[in-house]
């Protein structure tokens, strides 16, 4: 069986997880992408996803999760803001490609959130200070129920709105910090 590698992030409550998952530009730029948690026994569960087709540089906020898909750079930026201890777990970025299985993007993220507030961000560039400004207006997206004829319509969380905002821009001049960890057998 294929063993998947993990990248560990240790953060404090209130901080922000900020990860970048890169993908093959030409192939997946407009594909719908998702952020999943891996439950016990290898049971991925989708927590949030981009729109379908995925829009370029268009933030999608679902609760405390913000997804931004940068087509030009072939990367999906995932932020989980105001982290809680209960957010600890194993996560992954995937690309939806029905009817095939979702395509996993590189290494998984092992998030460990501990109690206590660190006033200054640690050396990990992916941590931020406790006070984090969530963009007030972002786009919401619902994730697909694959082939069910009994599709149920989900009401999204109350914390979402419908227009994009420049507040969430990021500097992508240097994307060399994207870590590619190969899958090994």
């Amino acid at each position: 069986a294929t063993k998947l590698t993990e990248e560990k992030y240790e953060l404090k409550e209130g901080q922000t997880l900020d990860v970048k998952c890169d993908y093959t530009l030409e192939k997946f730029a407009s594909s719908q992408k998702a952020w999943q948690i891996i439950r016990d026994g290898e049971m991925p569960k989708t927590l949030a996803c981009t729109e379908r087709p995925s829009k370029n540089s268009h933030p999608v906020q679902v609760g405390r999760i913000i997804l931004e898909d940068y087509h030009d750079h072939g990367l999906l930026r995932v932020r989980m803001v105001n982290l809680q201890v209960e957010d600890s777990g194993l996560y992954q970025c995937v690309i939806y490609q029905p009817p095939k299985e979702p395509h996993m993007l590189f290494d998984r993220i092992r998030l460990v959130v501990t109690k206590g507030f660190s006033g200054t961000p640690g050396s990990n560039e992916n941590s931020t200070q406790n006070v984090y400004k969530i963009p007030p207006t972002t786009t919401k997206a619902l994730c697909p129920l694959y082939t069910s004829p009994r599709t149920v319509t989900q009401a999204p969380p109350k914390s979402t709105a419908d227009v994009s905002t420049p507040d969430s821009e990021i500097n992508l001049t240097n994307v060399t910090d994207i870590i590619r960890v190969p899958v090994f057998n």
Epitope: A34, R39, G41, A48, I65, Y96, P99, E101, C143, Q154
Partner: antibody, heavy 121, light 112 residues
Framework: QVQLVQSGAEVKKPGASVKVSCKAS????????MHWVRQAPGQGLEWMGI????????SYAQKFQGRVTMTRDTSTSTVYMELSSLRSEDTAVYYC??????????????WGQGTMVTVSS | DIVMTQSPLSLPVTPGEPASISCRSS???????????LDWYLQKPGQSPQLLIY???NRASGVPDRFSGSGSGTDFTLKISRVEAEDVGVYYC?????????FGGGTKVEIK
């Protein structure tokens, strides 16, 4: 239409094993997780475990660890739940129930009709 | 494990009148995506359970709009605006926030 059809009632002796099947139809078998839930006579619902039909991976409730085995056969879109070392307390109706694998919700939207397993000497 | 506590145990109702069932969890069921992983099921006499409400407040396909779910975190409520005779059975809440999935003890709704 979408349905889960389970195997028929079973009567077993203490110490024996039982294997209950759940055949899925009307949807893409590998796109949905399958759970097993049991209900003792006059009692509430108790979660036993889950299987991912896509890869066959499983996760069981602590209470059943070592006694339960969940498997699947993708060629027939069937999942199986085998419970060993049966005791009288295992007398119950056993249900399979599906959960959408790629959806945000973790609810069980389709249930099998149930299989009554009676453990008696 | 997350413990789910339902009340009341039994609920005698009059057709046409409202009914309310409470469900409390020992830990918050609110996930990072803003959804509460709390579902409601109805098990009619002699039948398998059926999904009524998922993610705290979303009605499943085919469920009449007299059923509604509300609440967040650890406190949830299922309301039936006007009970009908076909609504009798045992109602269960279930948390799907983390394994193992756990159910409330059930609330038996019967006609007075």
């Amino acid at each position: 239409q979408v349905q889960l059809v389970q195997s028929g009632a079973e009567v077993k002796k203490p110490g024996a094993s039982v294997k209950v099947s759940c055949k899925a139809s009307g949807y893409t078998f590998t796109s949905y997780y399958m759970h097993w839930v049991r209900q003792a006579p006059g009692q509430g619902l108790e979660w036993m475990g889950i299987i991912n039909p896509s890869g066959g991976s499983t996760s069981y409730a602590q209470k059943f660890q070592g006694r339960v085995t969940m498997t699947r056969d993708t060629s027939t879109s069937t999942v199986y739940m085998e419970l060993s070392s049966l005791r009288s307390e295992d007398t119950a109706v056993y249900y399979c129930a599906r959960e959408a694998g790629y959806d945000i919700s973790s609810a069980f939207d389709i249930w099998g009709q149930g299989t009554m397993v009676t453990v008696s000497s | 494990d997350i413990v789910m506590t339902q009340s009341p145990l039994s609920l005698p109702v009059t057709p046409g009148e409202p009914a309310s069932i409470s469900c409390r969890s020992s830990q918050s069921l609110l996930h990072s995506n803003g959804y509460n992983y709390l579902d409601w099921y109805l098990q009619k006499p002699g039948q398998s359970p059926q999904l009524l409400i998922y993610l705290g407040s979303n009605r499943a396909s085919g469920v009449p709009d007299r059923f509604s779910g509300s609440g967040s975190g650890t406190d949830f409520t299922l309301k039936i605006s006007r009970v009908e005779a076909e609504d009798v059975g045992v109602y269960y809440c279930m948390q799907a926030r983390q394994a193992p999935w756990t159910f409330g003890g059930g609330t038996k709704v019967e006609i007075k």
